[in-house]
């Protein structure tokens, strides 16, 4: 079997079970004239052997623990013992096995915990070692806690971390812990190698003391610090403490702010380092740190909040240096002229923010002072004496006086006179007549241009035209611009249009006055425009309703079984015929009509989960517009594949006679899911027959073993049958053969006499 | 025990061949390599090369590659070195040797068979 | 090739005295096996060469303890302790670490 296990001299690499008695030659190296020998150096450790043949083997179970890896050189020789071909490296890969349980390295811990300390934060560490590999299951540790006493409501306060050993708080026990309640805890910790996947894994256990210490590391009370304060600064305002000395304090600006005023000192005492403005900013909350020397927080930061107070430090202002309100001719007394609203940047709904308004001056005086008034706490300016004219005085100053308890400020009005409002807005036309666009027309486009004209007084209230549409178009689509000096709208697209939706939009514009009309005057039909908006269709691709489409199913569904379905609906209402794209197994078919997904074939697992094919949804009719979706289907493992040897084990061998009863270990696998806990194999032999001269033990949930009962054996091949059950449900069961040859050795090597090499078994027991 | 018996010493012409024998008893014949050294009374002690019995194989150290032939005969367990187109620095005496198999040295050395090349 | 040198053409010595003789190589013969692949023996006057030691240290089956063999991988030494009259002769020393196999050129044992 060239190749496999001969072949020429050459850079190898071989993997052997660790604990395993040697049941395999590992190689035979083949020699070029003038090479008649070998020669085996390096790591041999008395274990690895050549012969002179070429036969490398090894004599005794290996320990990986020992050694994981033996470097080997082998040399071919001539006559002489001159090497005439390498030496090459051969790298025996010594597989690890679980033959080592994980230990504590103590039997007992102790520690102690504060209480609120930050849940997750370690502050001890049980370790274990384990001597396997801990690349593999059998050298990673699982940690866990077994019991907690005592167990308060049935809620664990401590957890520890599976693979490191860290135990720390959780949050309950971060909230909860007091050490006035109970000051002491007792942990049984539990390791388990084979990541504590299995239920052949070794373990250990060891007991944890834990005491409770008082945490002072608190927030303090929200601070209240009054601002503008004059005192000498820094002031120290609060403080927080660590448990224990030597902690590093800092504050922590979440809020980012240019200046942030306070500070810590090493005491953990906390200053305002400026005064405060509260029209700045009212409100501080920030956090206070406690690091060890290494710059590691110790815990949770502190929130520090600081309430700025207010004093009455800013006077009322303006809201602009003159405001200006229109009245009407003739309008009657107690109408609402405007509202002057000032400003006062102290807080709200205060002393210190509350204003009074009073009339101060009025000119001119005409016909007489007093023509207007103000109310005190509102600002609202009404007419108080009697209706204006506007040849007799077209304009008005008033100066008010605003204040709050401390200061006072003067604001001025400007009141002008305007015409009355007798003239209605008139539409140079009453019908814009039928406009057609495409619905993918830009947003912001200009569609229309309106005219209203208005004969009041120009620029006032009274002809100013604002244009509203008010019927036709209730999802807001369009909006109409007015240019004040003109008075032309501009009537823009403000929401893309739909075809669908709204194919003809009857449209009505209202134009109208900012100033209201006059008694007895009211809006007619000249204030009222229509056009007609005509939408056509642009072809729009069919619309999956999701991105992607999952299903879930077993992978023994029955051929014919819905798997899922997809849906699209096409803007334009066409209808829609749907069609599966990328099915490479040939395991599905959709229904064109309604996107139902059947299966057309046994669906298989094993072969790949989740199974991706793209949907696709066309146009029926129309320019056949098509859209891709995917559909995913999650396969659910079923127990289909019995149990299979994991390797070739061809060439098994005894050497005869045997001397003792001999044995060989054999794994076994399987393809379908194993979560958790790996395959759960049971053993056993194939026939009954067999039970004179063999016997199957389990070793783990993979591995057995295979002894002879005796030693009384042919020189010949037997085949031994050995069945192998997987306990799923269903169970499901192989019988597999192990073909094992009792032949005559030499130098612990099946011998055949020369001419006779084919078939030389290549495992030796 | 293991002995090398060779042939008697050789007058010969300069320009002529000669034949020695390393006759072999004690031990099986192609077992081991069976090596050929010249020494001569100013020069010291040469490495001429070997053969393998077993499968006939020589090798010849550069400097003797025209001038020497080996071969063995298994069926009288007789080693044969030729030495041709002799000159007067071929006078010497030869050696024939055993090197004994895995563990690598000259454990049995011949006789010697001196050479004269002389006309 | 490997050069060896005896630098030592002859060495006197009174019997029941210790002499060394030495040997170098221009290669070192150690082999990554762990061996050395000098070699050691003594040509009497009118006889065939006869093996003292091999493979650096050790002593060949029948060689009297006397001999021994010692060094490093290119500096070498045979000593014999007590010489007597029949260890007079020429002691040469051979490397047989590759082809072609050489030769020291031999150091003659003299009594005193």
């Known amino acids: 079997q060239e190749g496999k296990f001969s072949g020429p001299l050459k850079p190898m690499t071989f993997s052997i079970y660790e604990g395993q008695e040697p049941s395999q030659i590992i190689f035979q190296f083949k020699a070029n004239p003038p090479a008649v020998t070998f020669e085996l150096t390096g790591e041999t450790d008395n274990i690895f052997v050549i012969e002179r043949e070429g036969l490398l083997y090894y004599n005794r179970a290996l320990d990986r623990e020992t050694r994981s890896t033996h470097n080997l050189q082998v040399a071919a020789l001539d006559a002489n013992g001159i090497i005439v071909e390498g030496p090459v490296p051969i790298t025996i890969k010594v597989k690890d096995i679980n033959d080592n349980r994980p230990t504590f390295l103590q039997s007992k811990y102790e520690g102690s915990v504060r209480q609120n300390s930050r849940p997750g934060k370690p502050f001890l560490y049980v370790n274990a070692t384990d001597l396997d590999d801990p690349a593999t299951p059998n050298g990673q540790l699982y940690y866990q806690i077994v019991i907690q006493l005592p167990m308060i409501n049935n809620v664990m306060y401590f957890q520890i971390n599976n693979k490191t050993g860290a135990i720390s708080l959780t949050r309950e026990g971060s909230q909860e812990l007091n050490p006035a309640k109970n000051p002491s805890y007792n942990l049984v910790i539990s390791v388990k190698d084979m990541g504590g996947q299995s239920e052949n894994s070794f373990s250990d256990t060891t007991s944890v003391d834990i005491i409770v210490t008082e945490n002072i590391w608190k927030a303090p009370k929200p601070v209240e610090m009054v601002e503008n304060s004059t005192d000498p600064h820094p002031i120290k305002i609060t403080q927080v403490r660590w448990n224990d000395p030597g902690a590093q304090y800092s504050l922590v600006d979440k809020e980012k702010l240019p200046r942030f005023p306070f500070s810590i000192d090493q005491e953990g005492d906390i200053y305002v380092t400026q005064p405060l403005d509260r029209e700045e900013k009212d409100a501080y909350v920030f956090y206070a740190v406690a690091k060890d020397e290494y710059g590691k927080p110790l815990s949770y930061p502190l929130e520090i909040h600081v309430k700025v107070k207010d004093i009455n430090d800013n006077p009322p202002t303006c809201p602009s240096p003159v405001t200006v309100f229109e009245v009407q001719e003739n309008e009657r007394l107690g109408n609402s002229i405007g509202t002057l609203t000032a400003h006062d940047r102290d807080e709200e709904n205060t002393a210190n923010s509350f204003l009074n308004y009073r009339i101060v001056e009025q000119t001119p005086k005409l016909p007489m002072d007093g023509l207007f008034l103000i109310q005190t706490y509102a600002g609202m300016l009404q007419l108080a004496k009697q209706s204006l004219k506007k040849q007799d005085t077209p304009q008005y100053n008033l100066t008010i006086e605003v204040s709050d308890k401390d200061f006072k400020t003067l604001c001025f009005v400007q009141i002008n006179v305007i015409d009355i409002n007798d003239q209605i807005p008139i539409f140079e036309k009453s019908d814009y007549g039928n406009l057609t666009l495409a619905e993918d027309t830009n947003i912001g486009s200009t569609i229309l241009t309106i005219q209203a004209t208005d004969a009041d007084e120009p620029f006032t209230g009274s002809s100013k035209i604002l244009y509203h549409i008010i019927k036709g178009d209730s999802e807001g689509r369009l909006g109409v611009d007015t240019d004040p000096h003109t008075n032309t709208g501009y009537v823009i697209i403000k929401k893309p249009l739909d075809f669908e939706t709204a194919a003809v939009s009857n449209i009505v514009f209202k134009a109208e006055n900012p100033e209201p009309l006059v008694f007895g005057v009211k809006y007619n039909a000249s204030s009222f425009a229509k056009f007609t908006l005509i939408v056509t269709d642009v072809n729009e691709a069919p619309q999956f309703s999701q991105h992607v489409f999952q299903a879930k199913v077993s992978e023994d569904v029955a051929i014919g079984t819905k798997v899922g379905n997809v849906t699209a609906k096409d803007p334009e209402g066409l209808d829609i015929s749907y069609s599966l794209r990328g099915d490479t197994r040939g395991w599905l078919k959709i229904d064109h009509v309604t996107g139902e997904i059947f299966s057309v074939a046994p669906l298989d697992r094993e072969a790949g989960s989740p199974y991706r094919v793209q949907v696709v949804a066309t146009e029926v009719g129309g320019s056949s517009l098509s859209s891709v979706s995917e559909f995913h289907l999650i396969l659910m493992d079923v127990n289909d594949n019995p149990p299979r040897l994991a390797k070739d084990y061809t060439g098994l061998f005894f050497c005869h006679p045997l001397s003792a009863p001999g044995s060989l270990i054999f794994e076994a696998t399987d393809d379908d899911q194993h979560l958790f806990r790996g395959p759960h194999f049971t053993f056993s032999l194939g026939s009954g027959s067999l039970q004179n001269d063999w016997e199957v033990s389990k070793i783990n949930g993979t591995h057995a073993r295979l002894s002879t009962r005796h030693t009384e054996f042919e020189e010949r091949e037997y085949v031994v049958l050995i069945r192998i059950n997987d306990g799923g449900r269903p169970p499901l069961e192989g019988i597999v053969s192990l073909p094992v040859t009792f032949c005559s050795c030499v130098e612990g090597s099946c011998f055949r006499p020369a001419g006779h090499q084919t078939g030389i078994p290549t495992v030796g027991m | 025990q293991v002995q090398l018996q060779q042939s008697d010493a050789e007058l010969v012409k300069p320009g002529a061949s000669v034949k020695i024998s390393c006759k072999v008893s004690?031990?099986?014949?192609?077992?081991?390599?069976i090596h050929w050294m010249k020494q001569r009374p100013e020069q010291g002690l040469e490495w001429i090369g070997y053969i393998y019995p077993r499968d006939g194989y020589t090798k010849y150290n550069e400097k003797f590659k025209d001038k020497a032939t080996l071969t063995a005969d298994k069926s009288s367990s007789t080693a044969y070195i030729q030495l041709n187109t002799l000159t007067s620095e071929d006078s010497a005496v030869y050696f024939c040797?055993?090197?004994?198999?895995?563990?690598?040295?000259?454990?049995?050395w011949g006789t010697g068979t001196t050479v004269t090349v002389s006309s | 090739d490997i050069v060896m040198t005896q630098a030592a053409p002859s060495v006197p010595v009174t019997p029941g005295e210790s002499v060394s003789i030495s040997c170098r190589s221009s290669?070192?013969?150690?082999?990554?096996?762990?061996?050395?692949?000098l070699y050691w023996f003594l040509q009497r006057p009118g006889q065939s060469p006869q093996v003292l030691i091999y493979?650096?240290?050790n002593l060949a089956s029948g060689v009297p303890d006397r001999f021994s063999g010692s060094g490093s991988g290119t500096a070498f030494t045979l000593r014999i302790s007590r010489v007597e009259a029949e260890d007079v002769g020429v002691y040469y020393c051979m490397q047989h670490l590759e082809y072609p196999f050489t030769f020291g050129a031999g150091t003659k044992l003299e009594l005193k």
């Open positions: 290669k070192s013969l150690l082999r990554s096996n762990g061996n050395t692949y």
């Open positions: 040797a055993r090197f004994y198999y895995g563990y690598w040295y000259f454990d049995v």
């Open positions: 493979r650096m240290s």
């Open positions: 004690g031990y099986t014949f192609t077992d081991h390599t």
